[in-house]
């Protein structure tokens, strides 16, 4: 049993390393934003025993504009630096182990096609003919200037692009 993709959080990103049950992941506030005190950026893949369906817990995260950065001049659009936003310590901290490194899951990403469109984010939709996941363009509210000027970058996932001995953490919708 695996979890579907976690929910979106305004002004935050998350890189999901594992969709496995009990995996714990962390949202990161966008540059220029910080985590509001008293909110948690953590989410965990848990099982609803009544329905036998896995889901991500709802993070209480609120990303608010960082007053310390409000009056700073933005970086040039061609370069994005990493200064400014540091994840704050939380009472509930990740265990330190990386779920993605502990056990390989089935490779369900080989049929994924991603078209990264300038100024857009991507949303998955089920292909009725194949049942594989397709990624379609969806307008984003947090694209950067550099995204809107860059050319399209088409990704067609293929198992041949994996490094030797590497098993991608694919995700399959909960059954």
């Amino acid at each position: 049993i695996t979890c579907p993709p976690p929910m979106s959080v305004e002004h935050a990103d998350i890189w999901v390393k594992s969709y496995s049950l009990y995996s714990r992941e962390r949202y990161i506030c966008n540059s220029g934003f910080k985590r509001k005190a008293g909110t948690s950026s953590l989410t965990e893949c848990v099982l609803n025993k009544a329905t036998n369906v896995a889901h991500w817990t709802t993070p209480s995260l609120k990303c608010i504009r960082d007053p310390a950065l409000v009056h700073q001049r933005p970086a040039p659009p061609s370069t994005v630096t990493t200064a400014g936003v540091t994840p704050q310590p939380e009472s509930l901290s990740p265990s330190g182990k990386e779920p993605a490194a502990s056990s390989p899951s089935s490779n369900n990403t080989a049929a994924t096609t991603a078209a990264i469109v300038p100024g857009s984010q991507l949303m998955p939709s089920k292909s009725p003919s194949t049942g594989t996941t397709e990624i379609s363009s969806h307008e984003s509210s947090h694209g950067t200037p550099s995204q809107t000027t860059a050319k399209n970058w088409e990704l067609t996932a293929s198992a041949s692009h994996q490094p030797p001995g590497v098993y991608p953490q694919g995700h399959s919708d909960t059954t």
Epitope: D13, L155, A157
Partner: nanobody, 122 residues
Framework: EVQLVESGGGLVQPGGSLRLSCVGS????????VGWYRQTPGKQREWVGV???????DYADSVKGRFTISRDNAKNTVYLQMNSLKPEDTAVYYC????????????????WGQGTQVTVSS
């Protein structure tokens, strides 16, 4: 077709520094997120860190405070600056172009570079 090419690896003494580069080429380099991974022989791949489109970053606990990820969109390049290197950082390092499944929600794709070897030894 998009290609990712890592470079900058090499042999370095403990406590030393290296900067790895991940260059994307193809029809363009409009990236939501780029992750770095590393792998040692016989072991499962380990996530190192990620940089998102806003420039915010996240790191594995094992490298936090020592490694820094940045990007230069004009050069279609993402960097992994590695400081205070330890023997246990020895691995082949890969970059990965993320797939965005929901707004702000990313995961690895099957697009990888060829990797670059980093060896930390005295």
């Amino acid at each position: 077709e998009v290609q990712l090419v890592e470079s900058g690896g090499g042999l370095v003494q403990p406590g030393g520094s290296l900067r790895l580069s991940c260059v994307g080429s193809g029809d363009g380099f409009s990236i939501s997120a780029v992750g770095w991974y590393r792998q040692t022989p016989g072991k499962q791949r380990e996530w190192v860190g990620v940089i998102f489109s806003s420039g915010s970053t996240d790191y594995a606990d094992s490298v936090k405070g020592r490694f820094t990820i940045s990007r230069d969109n004009a050069k279609n390049t993402v960097y992994l600056q590695m400081n205070s290197l330890k023997p246990e950082d020895t691995a082949v390092y890969y970059c990965n172009a993320g797939v965005t499944t929901n707004r702000g929600v990313h995961r690895e794709s099957n697009y990888w570079g060829q990797g670059t070897q980093v060896t930390v030894s005295s």
